[in-house]
Interface confidence: low
């Protein structure tokens, strides 16, 4: 709990959690209870806190931008809103979440930027006769998926060096001489067609294309990869179009470090470096980019990559597509046959998906989203929604929290995968305390200027201490606060501070006493209560409410329940003690001791019953009940009966004779008699 | 409840800077969520909205009256004011502080209510 | 930016009767968290402004149950469904959707007869 968290200042009670307010009202508390003053806002306000004196910054957002999502067609392209909102300031308590909504709706006839990357090494030479008349027919079948399509064209081979090219002036001129063929020399990339919407230039630059070769497997795609990304004016990609990388190829690609083969030892620098005749000119002096570099520019320039390569290399661009947001995998045949369907419908897949990446300044701050996709349905722990039909709206709820307070605004930014829009984030920790702006330097309040005054407390300077700078170090004996000698300081339960004790706060209680050695937790319980709920505990001891008594308070001082209904205390017949009649005449019982069969003379009452059923034989004993009812008795015959607690009684009869019986008494305090005997009846007169 | 009070001087001086300051009695100016605005209304005509801030120093300015504005806040008095340079007649007009409640993300929605607390307003003459 | 247009700028009505304001908006405000963010506002003689509805049809705190607010999208209706003489004034819509802006319609002036 807050109170527990031992804060001293304004700020350190603010970090045990986003649920702990600080009270700056300058006499909240008696001078020793600094830690009384961190608590929740309702403890606070309880303890007599001023709500105007309760600092207890929340977690907030404040929307700086939330233009509404754009439906249908736009005029221009410009003003296409996918999603809402587009910039916030978000204020975190640390440990606090706070949560917010984002929207995204990818818009009706979005427009479309396809740069096509083909690699003309050896093997393509029949994918570029397959795709001689691919601009007119990719155009064709776009306009049906968007008003506004325009295609590029750019290809690549392989960096020109050794030992990736043969290196003798025949090969270096005529790569293919060896089959013998005419190809042109190898070369890294080149940018050919910027995006355009005239698709027959794009079929002219297709005819046009001449293969190349190298010697090994792997080509340089990875290069050109990199180039098409980040030359963004040179490529011609829109600022509010979806930017759409084809690459073509039937080979795998190198990365990273690669080229050490090659000695190129210098790190790919991720930017663009194409010539004025539109070349990669920096292919033989940087290393390929590695995936982690690729992935970052990708990102930052939306361009979504569909691989679409041959079965051979399916499974291993399908590991790289993994890794790279929104890539995608087409299986290309043999001679390019299917291009044509294979971007339609890695198209429309990417279309179907949105999904959500975030980027900038993330480290140590816990970001969870919640997708909601269609008909509202909730994904956990998921930032993707899947088949989705474009005009959909996929929201996602972003839930975010910092652990601890950074002196730092952090920026973020949340946006849907390939699409420009994006919504800005700032955040930002909340934990000063207003209270710290007002600060009153050598206070007054401060024993003589012995600190500084803020937030209702004493900050002390060095060689002071206390709740209000009081004590010097040379007042630190702590003799005063031992209730003995031989006792720890403080009882072991607070800390001595210029010879007196400030006692610990205690989560059972309150601690308190000149040495801290009382409290009001440690007395007896009752059933588990602290002296029986009846009562205070004070210094060890129960100090028992109006109404109770005893060690425990467990015992009331009303007799209203031992009172009988003839308004005699027990009957008569015993003490009320607790509450309770403890009977003291033998054989009395029931709650009042009404029930005493052995009360009075028990045998005598009940002669007649006995007499007449000693008497009586047959028929004539049925005439001994009411005899019997009327003495509030009854006779058993039965043998087997329990004998404690019954009165044995002898009387004498008329005939002389002695009369022997047992009185016990049932659960109702009826007489029930047993044993009936005579004996020692006078003989007859011996009358011959 | 939250009261709003415009104060300022009535007459000010063409190509002068009008200063105009709202104080927020009855409630915090730092409390989340409200964005405090300033409108005018030019005499016999309807309501222009002029701009508004959120107590942490973000300002918003009406794009026709941008170049000319600068509003501020002071939440250790409870204040937040107005600043129009450059006057001419045209900025004869009442002026209104209030209290707007625009949309504000949190918990995962959004809340709104418009302008729920106005000041009386305070009429300003701009005349040499 | 939003364009705010109301109809019909001025209302001569009998006490008791109904009176209804148009507004509309050049485009959708709807908002993505599914609210349309739409507010009245009626400005006494002498007196600033004062929220009468906010969210389309939400009757702001105080607001007597005769004013009434529908529509969607970009069509907005205000009703006063028997006017009394302390509703005399001018009335105001304003769009809540494009932050940072808040625009009001031109204003209708009602009036009794």
């Known amino acids: 709990g807050c109170a527990l968290g031992g804060a001293e200042t304004c700020e350190d009670c603010l970090l045990i959690g986003p649920q702990c307010a600080w009270c700056a009202q300058e006499n909240f508390t008696r001078p020793s209870g600094v830690g009384e003053r961190c608590d929740t806002p309702a403890n606070l306000l309880a303890k007599g806190c001023q709500l105007n004196f309760i600092e207890n910054p929340v977690s907030q957002v404040e929307i700086l931008k939330n233009k509404p999502l754009s439906v249908g067609r736009q005029k221009n392209s410009s003003d296409i809103v996918q999603i809402a909102p587009q910039s916030l300031i978000l204020k975190l308590r640390p440990g606090g979440a706070q949560t917010l909504q984002v929207h995204v709706r990818q818009t009706e006839d979005y427009p479309v930027d396809l740069y096509y990357l083909m690699d003309l090494s050896a093997s393509m030479d029949d994918d570029l006769n397959t795709i001689k008349e691919l601009g007119s027919r990719l155009s064709k079948e776009m306009s049906k998926l968007t008003s506004n399509f325009r295609l590029g064209f750019g290809s690549f081979v392989e960096k020109p060096v050794s030992p990736f090219v043969k290196t003798t002036p025949e090969e270096i001129a005529n790569p293919c001489s060896s089959i013998p063929y005419f190809c042109l020399p190898t070369f890294g990339f080149k940018h050919i067609l910027p995006l355009t919407n005239d698709a027959e230039r794009f079929n002219e630059i297709v005819k046009n294309q001449k293969i190349s070769a190298n010697i090994d497997t792997p080509e340089g795609g990875f290069d050109a990869i990199m180039q098409a990304a980040v030359c963004k004016e040179k490529i011609g990609w829109r600022n509010d179009s979806l930017h759409l990388l084809v690459f073509v190829s039937d080979a795998d690609s190198h990365f990273g470090m690669d080229s050490k083969l090659a000695g190129i030892v210098i790190p790919n620098d991720g930017l663009c470096h194409l010539d004025s005749k539109n070349e990669y000119s920096m292919s033989t002096v940087l290393e390929y980019p590695t995936i982690g570099q690729l992935i970052d520019k990708l990102v930052q320039n939306n361009v979504l990559l569909i691989f679409a390569v041959t079965q051979e290399q399916v499974h291993l661009y399908e590991n790289y597509a993994k890794l790279i947001p929104g890539a995608t995998v087409g299986l290309l045949q043999k001679d390019s046959g299917n291009i044509l369907q294979l971007i339609i419908s890695a198209y429309e897949e990417l279309r179907s998906e949105v999904e959500l990446e975030v980027l900038g300044d993330t480290e140590g701050l816990n970001l969870s989203f919640t997708a909601i996709c269609n008909n509202g349905t909730f994904f956990q722990h998921q930032k993707k929604c899947s088949h989705m039909k474009v005009g959909d709206t996929a929201s996602f709820n972003v839930t975010v929290n910092i652990p601890n307070c950074e002196r730092r605004s952090r920026h973020i930014i949340i946006k849907p995968v390939g699409l420009g829009d994006a919504l800005e984030l700032l955040v930002s920790p909340e934990c000063n305390c207003d209270c710290q702006k007002e600060v009153e330097v050598n206070s007054s309040k401060c024993h003589h200027g012995n600190g500084s005054f803020q937030c209702g407390v004493c900050a002390c300077h060095p060689g002071h201490m206390g709740p209000r700078c009081e004590c010097g170090e040379d007042m630190l004996s702590t003799d005063s606060c031992k209730e003995a000698p031989d006792h720890p300081s403080c009882s072991g339960r607070g800390d001595c501070y210029c010879g007196q004790c400030i006692c610990h706060l205690s989560p059972y209680g309150n601690i308190y006493g000149p040495y801290c050695q009382c409290d009001n937790f440690s007395c007896v319980r009752h059933k588990g209560l602290l002296c029986g709920d009846n009562g205070d505990c004070d210094c060890g001891e129960c100090v028992c409410r109006s109404g109770w008594t005893g060690e425990y308070c467990n015992c009331t001082t009303s007799t209203d329940s031992c009172v009988s209904e003839d308004g005699v205390l027990c009957s008569g017949r015993g003490d009320c003690v607790c509450g309770k009649c403890v009977c003291a005449n033998p054989g009395a019982s029931g709650p009042t001791c009404e029930r005493c069969p052995t009360c009075g003379d028990p045998c005598n009452s009940k002669r007649s019953c006995i007499e007449c059923h000693l008497s009586a034989a047959g028929q004539a004993r049925e005439e001994c009940v009411d005899k019997c009812k009327l003495a509030g008795a009854t006779i058993s015959e039965e043998e087997d009966f329990s004998k404690d607690g019954s009165v044995s009684c002898s009387l004498q009869g008329e005939n002389e004779c002695l009369i022997t019986f047992l009185i016990t008494t049932d659960n109702e305090g009826k007489s029930i008699i047993h044993s009936i005997s005579e004996k020692d009846c006078p003989k007859p007169p011996n009358i011959p | 409840q939250v009261q709003l009070q415009e104060s300022g001087p009535g007459l000010v001086k063409p190509s002068q800077t009008l200063s105009l300051t709202c104080t927020v009695s009855g409630g915090s100016i730092s409390s989340g969520g409200y964005y405090w605005s300033w409108i005018r209304q030019h005499p016999g005509k309807g309501l222009e909205w002029i701009g508004y801030?959120?107590?942490?120093?973000?300002?918003y300015y009406n794009p026709s009256l941008k170049s000319r504005v600068t509003i501020s806040v002071d939440t250790s008095k409870n204040q937040f004011s107005l600043k129009l340079s450059s006057v001419t007649a045209a900025d004869t007009a009442m002026y209104y502080c209030?209290?707007?409640?625009?949309?504000?993300?949190?918990?995962?929605?959004?809340?709104?209510?418009?302008?729920?607390?106005w000041g009386q307003g305070t009429t300003v003459t701009v005349s040499s | 930016d939003i364009v705010m247009t109301q109809t019909p700028l001025s209302l001569s009505v009998t006490p008791g009767q109904p009176a209804s304001i148009f507004c509309k908006s050049s485009?959708?405000?709807?908002?993505?968290?599914?609210?349309?963010?739409l507010c009245w506002y009626l400005q006494k003689p002498g007196q600033p402004p004062q929220l009468l509805i906010y969210?389309?049809?939400n009757r702001f705190s105080g607001v007597p149950d005769r004013f009434s607010g529908s529509g969607s999208g970009t069509d907005f209706t205000l009703k006063i469904s028997r006017v009394e003489a302390e509703d005399v004034g001018v009335y105001y819509c304003?769009?809540?959707?494009?932050?940072?802006?808040?625009?009001f319609g031109q204003g209708t002036k009602v009036e009794i007869k």
């Open positions: 801030i959120y107590y942490s120093g973000s300002t």
């Open positions: 209030a209290r707007y409640r625009g949309p504000a993300a949190g918990r995962g929605d959004f809340y709104y209510f418009g302008m729920d607390v």
């Open positions: 969210e389309v049809s």
């Open positions: 485009q959708s405000l709807l908002n993505s968290d599914g609210k349309t963010y």
């Open positions: 304003m769009q809540g959707i494009q932050l940072p802006w808040a625009f």
